[in-house]
């Protein structure tokens, strides 16, 4: 698997979208983990709802939020209030029992905001992403901007 490099501004939010084959991964929970070293274990940061049918509901651990659109085959991870310490190598995983299949490897880089508190705009396009199981990023231009997921009526 290729590693996708994503950059985000310190203090802002970074949104990672890992796509996958919805049929192949039917019924499987997803997880976001941080890799400890080049060949080290991947330490779980957050995983989707314990009930697969409710996987689209946001689950949070600290400043990291995950939600999974299981029908579309997209798991979205949001790293809020990005800090220098958040930089590193991560994985999107699909869980099957005790096994974890890597959907995408993501290298997160944190940039110091040269504009301080001003809006930075959309700065980044992924360097590389494979044709199907890729990752994308949306760079939040507002510090508290967040898409509601799911939409409430």
């Amino acid at each position: 698997l290729n590693t996708t490099v994503l950059q985000g501004m310190a203090g802002q939010s970074l949104r990672v979208s890992c796509t996958y084959d919805a049929l192949k991964h039917w019924g499987r929970r997803k997880a976001w983990c941080r890799q400890l070293g080049e060949e080290g274990p991947c330490q779980r940061v957050v995983s989707t709802h314990g009930v697969w049918l409710l996987a689209f509901l946001k689950k949070r651990n600290g400043s990291t939020v995950i939600a999974d659109d299981t029908l579309a085959g997209t798991v979205t991870i949001t790293l809020k209030n990005l800090q220098a310490g958040d930089a590193g190598l991560y994985q999107c995983q699909s869980l099957r029992g005790r096994e974890a299949e890597v959907l995408q490897k993501v290298l997160v880089e944190v940039l110091e905001d040269p504009l301080d508190d001003q809006d930075a705009g959309d700065l980044w396009v992924p360097e590389e992403s494979s044709s199907f199981e890729g990752a994308q990023v949306e760079h939040s231009t507002s510090r508290n901007q967040e898409t509601s997921f799911p939409p409430t009526s």
């Epitope: 039917w26 019924g27 314990g50 689209f56 029908l71 799911p150 939409p151 009526s153």
Partner: antibody
């Protein structure tokens, strides 16, 4: 009128089986998750399990105490949800309700149950 | 499993009184909480979903608030038809209900 009607309850001996039905009308059955709940006499509400909408291909989830004994299924052509209860125990004695999951959109719903049936009594006793 | 502690278990209030029921989760459940009303011999009725959203057709005297572990359900002006048992229900981890609060008129 949006309505759910349960049927199939009754007196059954421990270890035996029973199938409850929940007939839906007044809404597009395939679009909603359906759930079963129960309430033992004089007690509170307990979730039994639910089944996803047609989009989720009949995927089910159950509470731990009934897993392996109870099975939820649905028949879209008849707009009926079923609760198949096997190896019944005396502690399964309760009023059983079916309920409809509240829908946000094609993909999203919330396990807030906005339409309920009147309930059917299941008594497990020798 | 997440435990939902509802209090009080019962209360008696006068018509027109403000009634408050609390529900405490054993761990953070975000806003994944609903409130139901159940009258004797009847099925439950959804009043509030996602902690604070009023279900369509439910009178505005009913409201809900809270997030994390502490949630509140309020009837701003108790009416005779509000006599019932009220339940909270979480869905952050599977589905569990609080023990219920029986509301009576003084």
């Amino acid at each position: 009128e949006v309505q759910l009607v349960e049927s199939g309850g009754g007196l059954v001996q421990p270890g035996r089986s029973l199938r409850l039905s929940c007939t839906a009308s007044g809404f597009t059955f395939d679009d909603h998750a359906m759930s079963w709940f129960r309430q033992a006499p004089g007690k509170g509400l307990e979730w039994v399990g639910f089944i996803g909408s047609k989009a989720y291909g009949g995927t089910t989830e159950y509470t731990a105490s009934v897993k392996g004994r109870f099975t939820i299924s649905r028949d879209g052509s008849k707009s009926i949800a079923y609760l198949q209860m096997n190896s019944l125990k005396t502690e399964d004695t309760a009023v059983y309700y079916c309920a409809r999951g509240k829908r946000y959109s094609y993909t999203y719903w919330t396990p807030a149950f906005d339409v309920w049936g009147q309930g059917t009594m299941v008594t497990v006793s020798s | 499993d997440i435990q939902m502690t509802q209090s009080p278990s019962s209360l008696s209030a006068s018509v027109g009184d403000r009634v408050t029921i609390t529900c405490q989760a054993s761990q953070d459940i975000t806003n994944y909480l609903n409130w139901y009303q159940q009258k004797p011999g009847k099925a439950p009725k959804l009043l509030i979903y996602d902690a604070s959203n009023l279900e369509t057709g439910v009178p505005s005297r009913f409201s809900g608030s809270g997030s994390g572990t502490d949630f509140t359900f309020t009837i701003s002006s108790l009416q005779p038809e509000d006599i019932a048992t009220y339940y909270c229900q979480q869905y952050d981890s599977y589905l569990t209900f609080g023990g219920g609060t029986k509301v009576e008129i003084k």
